[in-house]
Interface confidence: medium
């Protein structure tokens, strides 16, 4: 009696199942009681000897490519061996690599977590994923895993993480890059500093006093509000960041506490108060303002 090994499908794709069947065309299963064993190269597969002429392999991988055969043993211990059958497992090259961010849109608050998710639409087997920052040649991280997506995490984002990123995927057919994704790090404003600038060391009534408010950190645009004794004097915008100034023509009523507030939509911060007092220097006829 002749023995045949049939693999279905005969040219499997990585990750897909394969059924091996040990066939005896000229013998009915009722004619004799057989034990079956399947082999790859020199190694027995599955449970070893079994009464089933079929062996189900849940997932085939590139490294499972090889020469397969089966043996059948009768109750009288006669062993039949099939011819070797070559099974080539086909690897699907990676295709359509994309990079996405969590949070979506690539906008993240300083100190928050950022995840760069690299995905491939197609590809089988061990896929190597790499993440790159800007034009720096060395990668941030690389991972090899049997999945279509992989993640690179920045647990606490810093200002220096604001850059363009891309990822690369590869499974033995050469590297494929994703498109570039821009990361914007949103920084809440720091406590602003209020400075008073006068045209001379001791400003007099009718002089123009400049109130300059500046938050040293914070994503633009920043809106600055100016206050005298908690009464709003006005506001100024700094579209590109930096500080802003408010000019005031001095009168005797302008004595008192001044402060400013910076707001960039991520939180507001108020400066310390600066006090202005009118003094009358000895021998002087006009009022002067000191801070």
């Amino acid at each position: 009696a002749e023995l045949f090994l049939i693999a279905s499908p005969s040219h499997p794709t990585e990750g897909s199942p394969v059924t091996l069947t040990c066939k005896m065309p000229f013998l009915q299963s009722s004619d004799a009681q057989f034990q079956f064993c399947f082999f790859r190269d020199t190694r027995a597969l599955g449970p070893g000897w079994s009464s089933s002429p079929k062996l189900q392999i849940a997932a085939m991988w590139k490294e499972d490519t090889g020469s397969y055969w089966c043996e059948a043993q009768t109750m009288a211990s006669k062993v039949l061996r099939s011819r070797r059958s070559q099974i080539n497992v086909h690897r699907v090259p990676v295709a359509d690599v994309s990079l996405e961010t969590q949070p979506p849109g690539g906008q993240v608050m300083e100190g928050d977590r950022l995840v760069l998710i690299c995905s491939v639409a197609m590809g089988t087997g061990d896929i190597t994923f790499l993440w790159y920052k800007g034009a720096v040649g060395l990668n941030l991280q690389s991972k090899t895993q049997r999945s279509l997506t992989a993640e690179y995490e920045i647990p606490s984002v810093r200002e220096s993480d604001a850059e363009q990123y891309y990822c690369v995927a590869e499974n033995g057919y050469g590297p494929s890059p994703s498109g570039l994704v821009s990361i914007t790090v949103r920084i809440p404003v720091s406590r602003p500093i209020l400075m008073l600038r006068a045209p001379r060391a001791q400003a007099a009534v009718e002089d123009v006093l400049e109130l300059h408010c500046e938050a040293l950190r914070g994503s633009p645009p920043i809106l600055y509000w100016f206050y005298h004794e908690d009464i709003t004097l006005g506001s100024r915008s700094a579209p590109s960041g930096g500080g802003a100034s408010f000019n005031l023509s001095l009168t005797e009523e302008h004595s008192g506490n001044y402060s400013c507030e910076a707001n960039n939509g991520l939180g507001a911060q108020r400066s310390e108060a600066v006090t202005l007092n009118f003094t009358v220097p000895t021998g002087a006829r006009s009022n002067h303002l000191t801070s």
Epitope: G137, L138, L140, S142, V168, G174, P177
Partner: antibody, heavy 118, light 107 residues
Framework: EVKLEESGGGLVQPGGSMKLSCAAS????????MDWVRQSPEKGLEWVAE??????????YYAESVKGRFTISRDDSKSSVYLQMNSLRVEDTGIYYC?????????WGQGTLVTVSA | DIVMTQSHKFMSTSVGDRVSITCKAS??????VAWYQQNPGQSPKLLIY???TRHTGVPDRFTGSGSGTDFILTISNVQSEDLADYFC?????????FGSGTKLEIK
């Protein structure tokens, strides 16, 4: 400042062995893939071997001409990569550069000269 | 193995000129090409990767272009320090292979 410093080159007879070392500093060595590239007047620049990072299971790749004779290895704790060269041939003569990067070579050492001659 | 052919062993140019160095791959390598500059007695330096991405610190007079099998490194407004050997490299598949190099010389 990035530095790659090769050592271990010299004169060796055909059939002999030699081990090259490369000490790295100034970048995150554990994340980098490390390669050896050699250069000779006859063959120009020739990629020799690569060892990937721990995240890539330290996978190794070799040029066909050195497969079975050369072994690349790394010690991340020492930020060092090595090239063990056995059964050396006259055609293995050249300057051996230690390089770092992924696919393309970003960082290069100054090279160490290996001369295989009777 | 993929063969990278740099057909011009030498190229003559003058300071201030524009020069194009070509490299041809024996099969389609997509955009997986890097370019290196090597000055006499020194190790190579990375200029370009992904066929057209300039490496950090590389002057913008160096431009890479091409995809598939034909690649070009263009140096506009050549400076005296650009006189060196230039090599292309493919990283589409192992083994990585280099071109034989093009030496840029002054006329």
């Amino acid at each position: 400042e990035v530095k790659l410093e090769e050592s271990g080159g010299g004169l060796v007879q055909p059939g002999g062995s030699m081990k090259l070392s490369c000490a790295a500093s100034g970048f995150t060595f554990g994340d980098a893939w490390m390669d050896w590239v050699r250069q000779s007047p006859e063959k120009g620049l020739e990629w020799v071997a690569e060892i990937r990072s721990k995240a890539n299971n330290h996978a190794t790749y070799y040029a066909e001409s050195v497969k079975g004779r050369f072994t690349i290895s790394r010690d991340d704790s020492k930020s060092s990569v090595y090239l063990q060269m056995n059964s050396l041939r006259v055609e293995d003569t050249g300057i051996y550069y230690c390089t770092g990067g992924n696919y393309w070579f970003v960082y290069w050492g100054q090279g160490t000269l290996v001369t295989v001659s009777a | 193995d993929i063969v990278m052919t740099q057909s011009h062993k030498f190229m003559s140019t003058s300071v201030g000129d524009r020069v194009s160095i070509t490299c041809k791959a024996s099969q389609d390598v997509g955009s997986t090409v890097a370019w290196y500059q090597q000055n006499p007695g020194q190790s190579p330096k990375l200029l370009i990767y992904w066929a057209s991405t300039r490496h950090t610190g590389v002057p913008d007079r160096f431009t890479g272009s091409g995809s598939g099998t034909d690649f070009i490194l263009t140096i506009s407004n050549v400076q005296s320090e650009d006189l060196a050997d230039y090599f292309c490299q493919q990283y589409s598949s192992y083994p990585f292979t280099f071109g034989s190099g093009t030496k840029l010389e002054i006329k």
